[in-house]
C-alpha cells in the first residue's frame, strides 16, 4: 500500500515482561515485533551501546522476520539493558529489555504459605483463589480442581480424578495464571482447588478448599412456595 | 512399559568428544524434564544435567558446565548429552533419568525411572 | 550446594535382623509445599539405582513393607525391619529440592 507509516509495535504483549531472569547456560530470545511503510530495519543496543558480535563469546542471531535477538548459552557478562531499535524514514520506536543472569541453585518452585487461601461464597457468587510463585526456572503452572465420578474422588487405580482449570499458554501472562476467577458460583464448583508449579526440578502445589453456601432468602422462598399456588 | 535405553558410550581420549544418547518409551516424553547422571567406577552417583519437558531450560553440575550440553528432541523422544573436552575424570557409567512431570504427581515427581547405562571410558 | 553425609559405609547384618542408614543434610529439606524431599534407593551389582522410598516416607510401588523412610528437616533413616538376603547392595540418599541434585556417599549392605 502507499500509506506511509512510521514504525509501530505490532505486538506489545510479547513485550510486557521487561525483566528477564535467566539461569546461566540457557538461550535468551528478545523480540521487537513491529511493522511500518516502509518496512522498518531493527537494531540493537546493549547498555545504551551499538551491540556488536564480538562483544560476547558466541555472538548472537538476529531474526529480522520474526523481530528477535537471541542470545545462546548466556554467561554473567551478558546482564544489562537490551534495546531494540526499530527505525523508517518516517520515525523511531524503542523498547528495552533488561537481562539478568542467574547463577544461583535453581530449586523446586516455592509457593508462598498460605495461599491459596480456604474461600466461602454464596450460590451466585464470585470468588477468586491466588498463587504466588517464585521459581527460578520458568515454571508451568496449572489450576486443577478435584472432582468426583459416580460419587467417589478416586479411581480404581486409586488416582484422584483430576480437572485442569486453567493452565499457562501462549496467551497468558504469569499474572493472569495466578489468580483462579469463578464467577456465579454454584453447588458444583463446591471442592478442593490446587495450584500446582512445575519446572525441571520438580513440581510443588498447594491446595484449598471452596464452600458454596446457600444464597440468603433462598430457604423462605422455598418455604413461601405453596402460599403462592393458592 | 516404560523404558530409558541410552547408547554412545565408548573408549575415547581425553580431549575428544563424544554424544550420548537415551531413547525414551512408554511415556509422554514431551511432559517430563529429563536428567544425566554419572557413575565412576567403584564410586557413588554424581548428578551432571537436567533439561525441561520442553528444553528451554538447562542446567549443569559446576564440574561439566562450558564441556557438555544437554539437548532433547521431543518429535523423536530423545535424550542427549554432548561431551566435549572430555576429561580422564568423566570416566563413569552414565545414567538417563525421568524427571519431573507435567501435571498434578500421583507419585513421586521424578526420579523414578532409570535407565541401565552406557559406559564412557576416557583414556590415553 | 546441599551436602548429603550418610553413615555407616558399610552394615553386614544377620538375616531376619534389622537395619538402619542415617543421612544428614547440610540443609533443610522441607519445602514450602510441607513435604521433605529426600529419596532412598539400592543400587543391586551391575545394575542401575531403584527407587525405595519417595519424599521423606512414601514406599515406591511394588517396594516390600519392610523397608521405611522417616526423619525431619535435615536429619533422615532409612529402616529395613527384617533384612532379607535379596536387600544387599548400595544404598543411598538423594535430595531433591535443587540443583545440583546431591547423593549420599552410599552404605554397603552385607549378609553375614
Known amino acids: 500500500s502507499n500509506n506511509k507509516r512510521a514504525p509501530y509495535w505490532t505486538n506489545t504483549e510479547k513485550m510486557e515482561k521487561r525483566l528477564h531472569a535467566v539461569p546461566a547456560a540457557n538461550t535468551v530470545k528478545f523480540r521487537c515485533p513491529a511493522g511500518g511503510n516502509p518496512m522498518p530495519t531493527m537494531r540493537w543496543l546493549k547498555n545504551g551501546k551499538e551491540f556488536k558480535q564480538e562483544h560476547r563469546i558466541g555472538g548472537y542471531k538476529v531474526r529480522n522476520q520474526h523481530w528477535s535477538l537471541i542470545m545462546e548459552s548466556v554467561v554473567p557478562s551478558d546482564k544489562g539493558n537490551y534495546t531494540c531499535v526499530v527505525e523508517n524514514e518516517y520515525g523511531s520506536i524503542n523498547h528495552t529489555y533488561h537481562l539478568d543472569v542467574v547463577e544461583r541453585s535453581p530449586h523446586r518452585p516455592i509457593l508462598q504459605a498460605g495461599l491459596p487461601a480456604n474461600a466461602s461464597t454464596v450460590v451466585g457468587g464470585d470468588v477468586e483463589f491466588v498463587c504466588k510463585v517464585y521459581s527460578d526456572a520458568q515454571p508451568h503452572i496449572q489450576w486443577i480442581k478435584h472432582v468426583e465420578k459416580n460419587g467417589s474422588k478416586y479411581g480404581p487405580d486409586g488416582l484422584p480424578y483430576l480437572k485442569v482449570l486453567k493452565a499457562a499458554g501462549v496467551n497468558t501472562t504469569d499474572k493472569e495464571i495466578e489468580v483462579l476467577y469463578i464467577r456465579n458460583v454454584t453447588f458444583e464448583d463446591a471442592g478442593e482447588y490446587t495450584c500446582l508449579a512445575g519446572n525441571s526440578i520438580g513440581i510443588s502445589f498447594h491446595s484449598a478448599w471452596l464452600t458454596v453456601l446457600p444464597a440468603p432468602g433462598r430457604e423462605k422462598e422455598i418455604t413461601a412456595s405453596p402460599d403462592y399456588l393458592e | 512399559e516404560v523404558q530409558l535405553l541410552e547408547s554412545g558410550g565408548g573408549v575415547v581420549q581425553p580431549g575428544r568428544s563424544l554424544r550420548l544418547s537415551c531413547a525414551a518409551s512408554?511415556?509422554?516424553?514431551?511432559?517430563?524434564?529429563m536428567h544425566w547422571v554419572r557413575q565412576a567406577p567403584g564410586k557413588g552417583l554424581e548428578w551432571v544435567a537436567v533439561?525441561?519437558?520442553?528444553?528451554?531450560?538447562?542446567y549443569y553440575a559446576d564440574s561439566v558446565k562450558g564441556r557438555f550440553t544437554i539437548s532433547r528432541d521431543n518429535s523423536k523422544n530423545t535424550l542427549s548429552l554432548q561431551m566435549n573436552s572430555l576429561r580422564v575424570e568423566d570416566t563413569a557409567i552414565y545414567y538417563c533419568?525421568?524427571?519431573?512431570?507435567?501435571?498434578?504427581?500421583?507419585?513421586?515427581?521424578?526420579?523414578?525411572?532409570w535407565g541401565q547405562g552406557t559406559m564412557v571410558t576416557v583414556s590415553s | 550446594d546441599i551436602v548429603m553425609t550418610q553413615t555407616p559405609l558399610s552394615l553386614s547384618v544377620t538375616p531376619g535382623q534389622p537395619a538402619s542408614i542415617s543421612c544428614r543434610s547440610s540443609?533443610?529439606?522441607?519445602?514450602?509445599?510441607?513435604?521433605?524431599?529426600v529419596y532412598w534407593y539400592v543400587q543391586k551389582s551391575g545394575q542401575p539405582p531403584q527407587l525405595l522410598i519417595y519424599?521423606?516416607?512414601n514406599r515406591f510401588s511394588g517396594v516390600p513393607d519392610r523397608f521405611s523412610g522417616s526423619g525431619s528437616r535435615t536429619d533422615f533413616t532409612l529402616k529395613i525391619s527384617r533384612v532379607e538376603a535379596e536387600d544387599v547392595g548400595v544404598y543411598y540418599c538423594?535430595?531433591?529440592?535443587?540443583?545440583?541434585?546431591?547423593f549420599g556417599g552410599g552404605t554397603k549392605v552385607e549378609i553375614k
Open positions: 512408554g511415556f509422554t516424553f514431551s511432559s517430563y524434564a
Open positions: 519424599e521423606l516416607s
Open positions: 533419568v525421568r524427571g519431573a512431570g507435567h501435571g498434578f504427581p500421583t507419585g513421586p515427581d521424578g526420579f523414578d525411572i
Open positions: 533439561i525441561s519437558y520442553d528444553g528451554s531450560n538447562k
Open positions: 540443609r533443610s529439606l522441607l519445602h514450602s509445599d510441607g513435604k521433605t524431599y
Open positions: 538423594m535430595q531433591y529440592v535443587e540443583a545440583p541434585l546431591t
